[in-house]
């Protein structure tokens, strides 16, 4: 069976991708250089390990997490890697240009690589809502637009609210979730009869998705502490994330069983809910003063994600007309908000305890930042969605959603693949 991937796209995609890569190489040649001030070899290794954790999370964790569609597992893993590789390159340049005025040479440090990996990870989270419905050319556009939008959001927030440019990555869960949902909302919706089969989750892909969830689970403390400089805050972030994740696993497995009429555990619910605690504490992990608070947050997050896993896909389908978004993705949007609300509450408590009269102002700033993040996510997501609907991308026909055969060469096509 020959590929149904339009020939025009198959011809121009490699050329376009290589041209884009050549352009990036030129930009790196003219505008970047390596950091001169980092020296100590032990420190280099310690810093690199954090970056390595992020890469494992992005490539393996998010790659396998989205591989739970029976006929779309190859594309999920490989397209994720492609987006990560492209996103990291563009993010390093963009962060370098946006974080310094006037723009000079971009200094590449281990920190800037971590920062870029996290920016690229936001694209991978968003892509969870559209993987299977778009081709590689469309994903390239999505990477470039979303990384640019996230960078712009951070620059706008740092200028308006006078905060550190790096700090604004704390909105990246919420940004990624709402960006992805908006893009998915713009894509062609109705699925013809007969293609439901492609969307069915089979045992093996669900196991690989669980493997992805495990990678994310193991390394989530790294993502929540990766950018923090203060040793105390970094320690708090790691410990709090660890405890929140631990509790959300217990909640996920027991809650999944509780939600089923026959008290059976759903793998689909579990592999998304086990990560709930990590997302929920992401924004405020450096602020949480005690493990019990992180654990309570993990519990609440686990319950929300089990509830969300049952209701959100139906809600997204019926109300918003968004079909077949991954459960994990729909949960990100809820838990990201929970995390932001927790941050604001903790900020209030901190300022009350320390007798600071600036509570109202701090809360107002935080709400303003969050609102701006959601607004920019929705507008840039809408723009991207409209852009991806253009005919030039030769998007896969709805009948070919979630189908690896459209994109991949198979050595021998086994019946029932």
């Amino acid at each position: 069976m020959s590929s149904k991937y339009p020939r025009s796209v198959r011809r121009c995609l490699p050329l376009c991708a290589l041209t884009l890569e050549a352009a990036l190489i030129l930009l790196f040649y003219f505008f970047t250089h390596y950091d001169a001030s980092l020296e100590d070899q032990k420190g280099l290794v310690a810093s690199y390990q954090v970056g390595q954790d992020l890469t494992v999370m992005a490539a393996l964790g998010l790659g396998f997490l989205t591989s739970n569609f029976r006929r779309h597992s190859w594309s999920s893993v490989a397209f994720n890697l492609f987006m990560l590789a492209l996103g990291v390159q563009w993010a390093i340049l963009l962060d370098g240009f946006l974080s310094q005025f006037p723009p000079g040479k971009v200094v590449i440090t281990l920190f800037s690589i971590r920062l870029a990996t996290m920016s690229a990870m936001s694209v991978l989270i968003s892509a969870g809502a559209v993987l299977g419905k778009v081709n590689l050319a469309q994903l390239v556009v999505m990477v470039l637009v979303e990384v640019t939008a996230l960078g712009t959001l951070r620059m706008v927030i740092s200028n308006i609210f006078n905060t550190d440019y790096h700090m604004n990555l704390r909105h990246f869960y919420v940004f990624a979730a709402y960006f992805g949902l908006t893009v998915a909302w713009c894509l062609p919706k109705p699925l013809p009869k007969g293609t439901e089969d492609n969307d069915q989750r089979a045992t093996i892909p669900s196991l690989s998705a669980m493997l992805g969830a495990l990678f994310l689970w193991m390394f989530w403390p790294s993502v929540n502490s990766a950018l923090l400089r203060s040793p105390i805050q970094r320690k708090n972030a790691m410990f709090n994330t660890y405890y929140a994740l631990a509790v959300s696993v217990v909640t996920a497995i027991s809650g999944s069983s509780l939600a089923h009429p026959q008290r059976k555990i759903s793998m689909t619910y579990v592999h998304s809910a086990v990560l709930a605690g990590g997302v929920a504490v992401g924004t405020s992990c450096h602020l949480i003063p005690s493990p019990w608070l992180a654990m309570v947050l993990g519990l609440v997050a686990g319950l929300i994600s089990i509830g969300g896993a049952k209701c959100l896909p139906v809600c997204c389908n019926r109300v918003l007309g968004i079909h077949h978004i991954s459960v994990m993705h729909s949960i990100f949007s809820l838990l990201g908000l929970l995390g932001e609300i927790t941050y604001i509450v903790l900020l209030v408590l901190h300022t009350v305890w320390n007798g600071n009269g600036m509570i109202g102002f701090q809360v107002l700033l935080s709400i303003g930042e969050l609102s701006l993040a959601i607004v920019i996510a929705l507008t840039s997501g809408l723009l991207t969605g409209l852009l991806l609907n253009l005919k030039i991308w030769k998007a896969p026909h709805v009948a070919k959603y979630f189908d690896d055969q459209v994109f991949w060469k198979f050595p021998h096509l086994a019946v029932g693949f």
């Epitope: 790096h166 923090l228 040793p231 450096h286």
Partner: antibody
Framework: EVQLLESGPGLLKPSETLSLTCAVS????????WSWIRQSPGKGLEWIGE????????YYNPSLKSRVAISKDTSKNRLSLKLTSVTAADTAVYYC?????????????????????WGHGLAVTVSS | AAELTQSPSSLSASVGDRVTITCQAS??????LAWYQQKPGKAPKLLIY???SLQSGVPSRFSGSGSGTDFTLTISSLQSEDFATYYC?????????FGQGTKVEIK
């Protein structure tokens, strides 16, 4: 109250290695970043470098990078500075200092809150 | 590296005067700037961090402002104990850099 006390030789000959230690009391070094700064006679302040108290990350002033090494001993709660091949230009008062932090405001990358606690300083003279 | 230029390099003022010292960065440093006071034979003392936040224990007559490249330290009513040298320091990138200092003398 946090206290920092620098110690080491006050007089060195050119080409020798300067070795200073900074004993910290009142705060575990693993919870903070720590800096070394020097001030030449009648001159301004010059940042030498800094170390993360919890991992081994160090940043140095590029003008001194080839000659300087900052290290820490968590068990003894103290910091060290080594400066090789000293010349008369290295004559200065050497300070160690702690970087402040604010629990409400996270810091990232190189950003920080200034040096909130300083040692009294140690005068070092390089002369033949 | 961001270079810091302080002005004036020295100034004479009387007790009760309002004194303003400026610090200009060669590139944008957001709000990552600290101000220090140093008296002869003593270690510097942190007055202001993050451009405008007053360090605990520092009198409220000291205030800081600015963002990006232009920063100001203001002493609203100069006291006798405020005669010293003042330094700004950027905390945006490595290497950290200090301004050359502003000496505040008695008129």
């Amino acid at each position: 109250e946090v206290q920092l006390l620098e110690s080491g030789p006050g007089l060195l000959k050119p080409s020798e290695t300067l070795s200073l230690t900074c004993a910290v009391s009142g705060a575990p070094i693993s919870n903070y970043w720590w800096s070394w700064i020097r001030q030449s006679p009648g001159k301004g302040l010059e940042w030498i470098g800094e170390i993360d108290g919890s991992i081994y990350t160090t940043y140095y002033n590029p003008s001194l990078k080839s000659r300087v090494a900052i290290s820490k001993d968590t068990s003894k709660n103290r910091l060290s500075l080594k400066l090789t091949s000293v010349t008369a230009a290295d004559t200065a008062v050497y300070y160690c200092a702690r970087e402040g932090q604010n629990p409400l405001v996270p810091t990232y990358g190189s950003t920080g809150f200034g040096l909130d606690f300083w040692g009294h300083g140690l005068a070092v003279t390089v002369s033949s | 590296a961001a270079e810091l230029t302080q002005s004036p390099s020295s100034l004479s003022a009387s007790v009760g005067d309002r004194v303003t010292i400026t610090c200009q960065a060669s590139q944008g440093i957001s709000s990552w700037l600290a101000w220090y006071q140093q008296k002869p034979g003593k270690a510097p003392k942190l007055l202001i961090y993050k451009a405008s936040s007053l360090q605990s224990g520092v009198p409220s007559r000291f205030s800081g402002s600015g963002s990006g490249t232009d920063f100001t330290l203001t002493i609203s009513s100069l006291q006798s104990e405020d005669f010293a040298t003042y330094y700004c320091q950027q905390y945006s990138s490595s290497p950290r850099t200090f301004g050359q200092g502003t000496k505040v003398e008695i008129k």
